[in-house]
Interface confidence: medium
């Protein structure tokens, strides 16, 4: 129904706390360089204005759209052009073009320092002094670094952060309590960020139809007892919600997400037997719980898929007269039978089925032509199964760090033109797939591995799009979203690449490496490894092992030395010489 004042409507639906959090996220995602203090001032102004509209929906400007109100606020910021350059040009446009312009200027890799977690005592002091401000800073810092983070989910992580701090700051050993718990929240949030970025990429590049297909497959896997009409309704709602969040309509997105959770909980009987535990929780936890819900049990009496989609004589009629509904039904039926497949694989199979019908229904004897289609799925299913098998075996053999290094070598050889920091980030994330997925039961491995890899590769594509340097990467990133992972997997050593000059300074290290945390130390070593591969793209595994082993010993030795600086200064050049020789 239409509301006189959109902002009043959202304020009443969401409540002040969530309203303020979402407005802060929206501003932080649009203007990523502004300090917290500047954003919080705007948030307060918007909140005060919303309250006047709640009191009187006919008050001045209350009838304006939220995009108009937010855009006007952002465009009134002094020195906007000084800080944001051409983003200020957006302010000359009218809505909806102005908002589109803001969206285009979102930076997936903003030039911001990594988010440093304060020391435990300091963190607890500032949290206890002002929890609202502390959590506001958290929202701001995460949102500006991840401009497509799913806003209602970020509110959930802030709530989790709050819970951890409330619990741990009363403990005697605060750090021991905080570190593992906050690490777990951070890990989940980072995965959520790349997953959501993938959803927004899907929406931006391929539109709502492609996203809805993804949603149908996912929902059918989770809720195999729900009917197609129910799955379609859920997929339509989820598509709308994600479109809103990806488009910067965060208040509407969060409000609609809460509505969907309410609907699901009121209709458990027709959706899934597993929802009850989620439905007893408060709104943010309820939505999150539903989003992570385990699969319902597959109905025992499902007939063979062939009866409906291969053996039936009406296949071509259905395809011709109701393409989307027929293909949607196929995707639903196949997905509900295969929770052990990745969504990407299910979409590839649906695409193969569509291409087969497209070809066969134009021929003289369609049933004879499409009769073998299910058998033709086999190679498409085997490819990702083999990928999981070989990569999990490698992970089990090498451990996470070693596996990351193997992936780094592989991807540097595939796309040596890509910047080293981007390659290292991608390889570290791709390498985490082992820890995340390879320890799961067999039936859960494939969906975990492939859908996670797809999200990480989407991040690589998004960064590469900003400064395209590799034709091969551009080719894989330009194609369909579901073909990306197989495309990257199929890439081999780039034969067109002219090896990088050997620069001694790239492999020169100082004593500051000794005091770095383990993660930073690993990144330094992995940076060196990527540079080595760029220098010698065809170096053998043994050569790289020798050089990296030598390097690790050198760092270890010098960090234990009494005069560290002197050790690095004298041993460093020897290491460089030995490395050059080993790679010759």
């Amino acid at each position: 129904e239409a509301h006189k004042s959109e902002i009043a409507h959202r304020f009443k639906d969401l409540g002040e706390q969530h309203f303020k959090g979402l407005v802060l996220i929206a501003f932080s995602q649009y203007l990523q360089k502004c300090p917290y203090e500047e954003h919080i001032k705007l948030v307060q102004e918007v909140t005060d204005f919303a309250k006047t509209c709640v009191a009187d929906e006919n008050a001045e400007n209350c009838d304006k759209s939220i995009h108009t109100l937010f855009g006007d606020k952002l465009c009134a910021i002094p020195k906007l052009r000084d800080n944001y350059g051409e983003l200020a040009d957006c302010c000359a446009k009218q809505e909806p073009e102005r908002n589109e312009c803001f969206l285009q200027h979102k930076d997936d890799n903003p030039n911001l320092p990594p988010f440093q977690r304060p020391e435990a005592e300091a963190m607890c002091t500032s949290f206890q002094e002002n929890p609202t401000s502390f959590l506001g800073h958290y929202l701001h810092e995460v949102a500006r670094r991840h401009p497509y983070f799913y806003a209602p989910e970020l509110l959930y992580y802030a709530e989790k952060y709050n819970e951890v701090l409330t619990q741990c700051c009363t403990e005697s050993d605060k750090a021991a309590c905080l570190t593992p718990k906050l690490d777990a929240v951070k890990e989940k949030a980072l995965v959520a960020a790349v997953r959501q970025r993938m959803k927004c990429s899907s929406m931006q590049r391929f539109g709502e139809r492609a996203f809805k297909a993804w949603a149908v497959a996912r929902m059918s896997q989770r809720f195999p007892n729900a009917e197609f009409a129910e799955i379609t309704k859920l997929a339509t709602d989820v598509t709308k919600i994600n479109k809103e969040c990806c488009h910067g309509d965060l208040l509407e997105c969060a409000d609609d997400r809460a509505e969907l959770a309410k609907y699901m909980c009121e209709n458990q009987a027709t959706i899934s037997s597993k929802l009850q535990a989620c439905c007893d929780k408060p709104v943010l936890q309820k939505s999150q719980c539903l989003a992570e819900i385990e699969h319902d049990n597959i109905p025992a009496d499902l007939p063979s898929i062939a009866a409906d989609f291969v053996e039936d004589k009406e296949v071509c009629k259905n395809y011709a007269e109701a393409k989307d509904v027929f293909l949607g039904t196929f995707l639903y039926e196949y997905s509900r039978r295969h929770p052990d497949y990745s969504v990407s694989l299910l979409l590839r199979l649906a695409k193969k089925y569509e291409a087969t019908l497209e070809k066969c229904c134009a021929e003289g004897d369609p049933p004879a032509c499409y009769g073998t289609v299910l058998a033709e799925f086999q190679p498409l299913v085997e490819e990702p199964k083999n990928l999981v098998k070989t990569n999990c075996e490698l992970y089990e053999k090498l451990g996470e760090y070693g596996f990351q290094n193997a992936v780094l070598v592989r991807y540097t050889q595939k796309a040596p033109q890509v910047s080293t920091p981007t390659l290292v980030e991608a390889a570290r994330n791709l390498g985490r797939v082992g820890t995340k997925c390879c320890t799961l039961p067999e039936a859960q491995r494939l969906p975990c591995v492939e859908d996670y890899l797809s999200a990480i590769l989407n991040r690589l594509c998004v960064l590469h799009e900003k400064t395209p340097v590799s034709e091969k990467v551009t080719k894989c990133c330009s194609g369909s979203l579901v073909e990306r992972r197989p495309c990257f997997s199929a890439l081999t050593v780039d034969e067109t690449y002219v090896p990088k000059e050997f620069k001694a300074e790239t492999f020169t290290f100082h004593s500051d490496i000794c005091t770095l945390p383990d993660k930073e130390k690993q990144i330094k070593k992995q940076t060196a490894l990527a540079e080595l591969v760029k220098h010698k793209p065809k170096a053998t595994e043994d050569q790289l092992k020798t050089v990296m082993g030598d390097f690790a010993q050198f760092v270890d030795k010098c960090c234990k030395a009494a005069d560290k600086d002197n050790c690095f200064a004298t041993e460093g050049p020897n290491l460089v010489a030995r490395s050059k020789e080993a790679l010759a």
């Epitope: 729900a226 129910e230 007939p303 009406e314 009629k317 007269e321 039904t329």
Partner: nanobody, 126 residues
Framework: EVQLLESGGGLVQPGGSLRLSCAAS????????VAWFRQAPGKGREFVAG????????YYADSVKGRFTISRDNSKNTLYLQMNSLRPEDTAVYYC???????????????????WGQGTLVTVSS
């Protein structure tokens, strides 16, 4: 739970007409594929006609094409089968069946339809 109730059967002369009705309760008839099947004495249940749910696509067995018309009235939650130019070989018990969650008639195999009415007898004889 879905309930289906057929009516409109009877005795009719060859060349005559009849209109069968199938009233549904427990679900909206426009949401799902619904079909008419028939069963002659000593034979299996065979597909006669069907209509898609949410998409008005109609399906007919070759033996009834051009003579029978399937339709539905969503406001009454009722499915119809208009039968013209009836022949003695059309004599059978006519059933309506539904496959919940199916927007299209993707099968004419009776075993795949979990919900049935009790049937209405149509006799074509002079």
């Amino acid at each position: 739970e879905v309930q289906l109730l057929e009516s409109g059967g009877g005795l009719v002369q060859p060349g005559g007409s009849l209109r069968l009705s199938c009233a549904a309760s427990g679900r909206y008839i426009d949401e799902t594929a619904v079909a008419w099947f028939r069963q002659a004495p000593g034979k299996g249940r065979e597909f006669v006609a069907g209509i898609g749910g949410g998409v008005d696509i109609t399906y007919y067995a070759d033996s009834v094409k051009g003579r029978f018309t399937i339709s539905r009235d969503n406001s009454k939650n009722t499915l119809y089968l208009q039968m013209n130019s009836l022949r003695p070989e059309d004599t059978a018990v006519y059933y309506c069946g539904t496959r919940p969650g199916r927007p299209l008639i993707t099968s004419k195999v009776a075993d795949l339809y979990p919900y049935w009415g009790q049937g209405t007898l149509v006799t074509v004889s002079s």
